[in-house]
């Protein structure tokens, strides 16, 4: 039996990745990914590279980070005399094609691959201490690496439901992952939690012709709040709703809307019209690195064309960050769930509150999307 994923994560582009610690040959790694419904992962430039690096940096595997680890990826050199000078992959290529793919900002080679005209040759991703990616390393396909990376592709995902009053959240993804949080979940993912009074609740991500949503979820919240306010998706009290600048950082629970003062929630009908059953601050946050995090009702548009983004500094090992989402809030004050309120890429909010196209936007800032993905 194949072990469950040590870590996994999904981005709003529909791509999910899982990292597994298991000593096996390349062929066995390919089969293991296929059994999970995916394929051995490519690690191309840009968002994909950052996603995989984030998984690695989430924490060491077996051995506590004391040695270098080698992970099988979908990189190979077909039989025949490849050109070892062909930069940057030295003639190696990814198993699946991406006609528009750029390889310019790929990792370096730990050591130059040998020239060979006979056998198919494979390559691994070497991670220093098991967490810090060093680069590609040629490895004979029949040898055993320390682990492997899988990739899964979906047309649409379910953004994480807001907990509200829920506790003990648990995500079970279809690719055999049991996790404490996933910012984006593929169809088939089941989220279970406890509501107040220890009442269990379970919702499942389902996809149809309209898109993807959590069945049996009312108002985006797993468990309703006893009060009027939510902050970062969790129930909150009014005194906790002010940000560092004194702005209103909460949204109103279902049945309430933002009052005329712009910082209190009143019973629906007494204030102003609401959008999707929740009141949101009337103040439109500018799309800057230091602005408050917009609440969950902002629409998000997916993008895969990211500018260069800094990788996340020191984080708790149980949290994996994929830096593919807009820097809508200050990193230092964002909790895991706050980060899950945002989505991937260059979608930015304009002063009017609409979302700038991910595709022709020229902004390139991004905030990490975080999730705890300790395996069961």
């Amino acid at each position: 039996e194949h072990p469950t994923a040590d870590r996994a994560g999904c981005s709003a582009s529909g791509a999910c990745y899982s990292l597994h610690h298991a000593t096996m040959k390349r062929q066995a790694a390919e089969e293991a990914c296929i059994l999970r419904g995916g394929a051995l992962s490519t690690v191309r430039a840009g968002a994909e590279l950052r996603a995989v690096l984030a998984l690695l940096r989430a924490g060491p595997g077996p051995g506590g980070g004391s040695k270098d680890l080698l992970f099988w990826v979908a990189l190979q050199l077909p039989p025949g005399c490849g050109d070892p000078k062909r930069l940057p992959l030295r003639g190696f290529s990814w198993l699946s094609s991406d006609p528009g793919g750029l390889e310019s900002d790929t990792l370096q080679w730990v050591e130059e691959p040998q020239r060979s005209c006979t056998a198919r040759r494979c390559a691994v991703l070497q991670a220093t201490g098991g967490v810090e990616p060093a680069g590609w390393k040629e490895m004979r396909c029949h040898l055993r690496a320390n682990g492997y990376l899988c990739k899964y592709q979906f047309e649409v995902l379910c953004p994480a439901p807001r907990p509200g009053a829920a506790s003990n959240l648990s995500y079970r993804a279809p690719f055999q992952l049991h996790s404490a949080a996933l910012d984006f979940s593929p169809p088939g993912t089941e989220v279970s939690a406890l509501c107040r009074g220890q009442l269990p609740i379970s919702v499942t991500c389902i996809a149809d012709e309209i898109g993807a949503r959590w069945d049996k979820l009312s108002g985006d919240v797993l468990c309703p709040c006893p009060g009027r306010y939510l902050r970062a998706g969790k129930c909150a009290e009014l005194p906790n709703c002010l940000d560092d600048l004194g702005g209103f950082a909460c949204e109103c629970a279902t049945g309430f809307e933002l009052g005329k003062d712009g910082r209190s929630c009143v019973t629906s009908g007494e204030g102003q019209p609401t959008l999707g059953g929740t009141g949101v601050p009337t103040r439109r946050p500018p799309a800057t690195a230091t602005s408050p995090v917009p609440q969950r009702t902002w629409p998000i548009r997916v993008d895969e064309k990211l500018g260069e983004t800094p990788l996340v500094p020191e984080q708790d090992n149980s949290v994996t960050s994929i830096p593919e989402i807009p820097r809508w809030g200050s990193q230092s004050t964002m909790s895991t769930l706050q980060m899950s309120l945002q989505a991937e890429s260059k979608a930015t909010i304009t002063p009017s509150g609409s979302v700038i196209s991910k595709f022709n936007s020229t902004t390139s800032s991004a905030t990490p999307q975080a999730f705890d993905s300790s395996s069961a």
Partner: antibody, heavy 127, light 106 residues
């Protein structure tokens, strides 16, 4: 920049055939579902066909009016979308657009929407 | 199939005027998308999932509705808003569009 450039349109006789192509660029084509939508001269928009991505087994869907006559297909390695049109009728005369099906996230849901349209290729069926 | 009926078919509005275009579905649909098309150009996604403005759409536009009744509203008409607007449902196959509402500047 996301683009879809259609080609292959032209004048064809009734019962004839035509193959439309759409060269997509600026996005990861193989992860998106795609559509063909047509617009007869001076008329409204009419959905023709949809093809999903590999992750959904390239499932295809058609408008009743084109079923068994038109075939939508794709070549992910070339980022190409196709529409094979057989047994053409005069009422098929229209501008044909290749359309990307984008995904938008709002709240805890994801929504499909036809978000990028090519410039269109004109098909005229006439004797 | 679900038939979408837009009204009015043609209308004109003066700058600053409030404009409402409605779309009625023959059966209940979950959401409605709206597209804008100007002569000689391809349609553009304008409002998705009933009420969300697509990229670059001015805030004077809004969308609302549920079930069989949906609408697109312009709070204050501007010259650049003159175009044809189409509603579209994707709750069931075949995907269908409304016949369009041509909005002219008075």
């Amino acid at each position: 920049e996301v683009q879809g450039v259609e080609s292959g349109g032209g004048l064809v006789q009734p019962k004839g055939s035509l193959k439309l192509s759409c060269a997509a660029s600026g996005f990861t084509f193989n992860t998106y579902a795609m559509h063909w939508v047509c617009q007869a001269p001076g008329k409204g928009l009419e959905w023709v066909a949809r093809i999903r991505s590999k992750s959904n087994n390239y499932a295809t869907y058609y408008a009743d009016s084109v079923k068994d006559r038109f075939t939508i297909s794709r070549d992910d390695s070339q980022s190409m979308l196709y529409l094979q049109m057989n047994n053409l009728k005069t009422e098929d005369t229209a501008m044909y657009y290749c359309v990307r099906e984008g995904v938008y996230y709002y709240g805890s849901s994801g929504y499909y929407a036809m978000d990028y349209w090519g410039q269109g290729t004109s098909v005229t069926v006439s004797s | 199939e679900i038939v979408l009926t837009q009204s009015p078919a043609i209308m004109s509005a003066s700058p600053g005027e409030k404009v409402t275009i409605t779309c009625s579905a023959s059966s209940s649909v979950s959401y409605m998308h709206w597209f804008q098309q100007k002569p000689g150009t391809s349609p553009k996604l304008w409002i998705y999932s009933t009420s969300n403005l697509a990229s670059g759409v001015p805030a004077r536009f809004s969308g609302s509705g549920s079930g069989t009744s949906y609408s697109l509203t312009i709070s204050r008409m501007e010259a650049e808003d003159a175009a044809t607007y189409y509603c579209q449902q994707r709750s069931s196959y075949p995907l269908t569009f409304g016949a369009g509402t041509k909005l002219e500047l008075k």
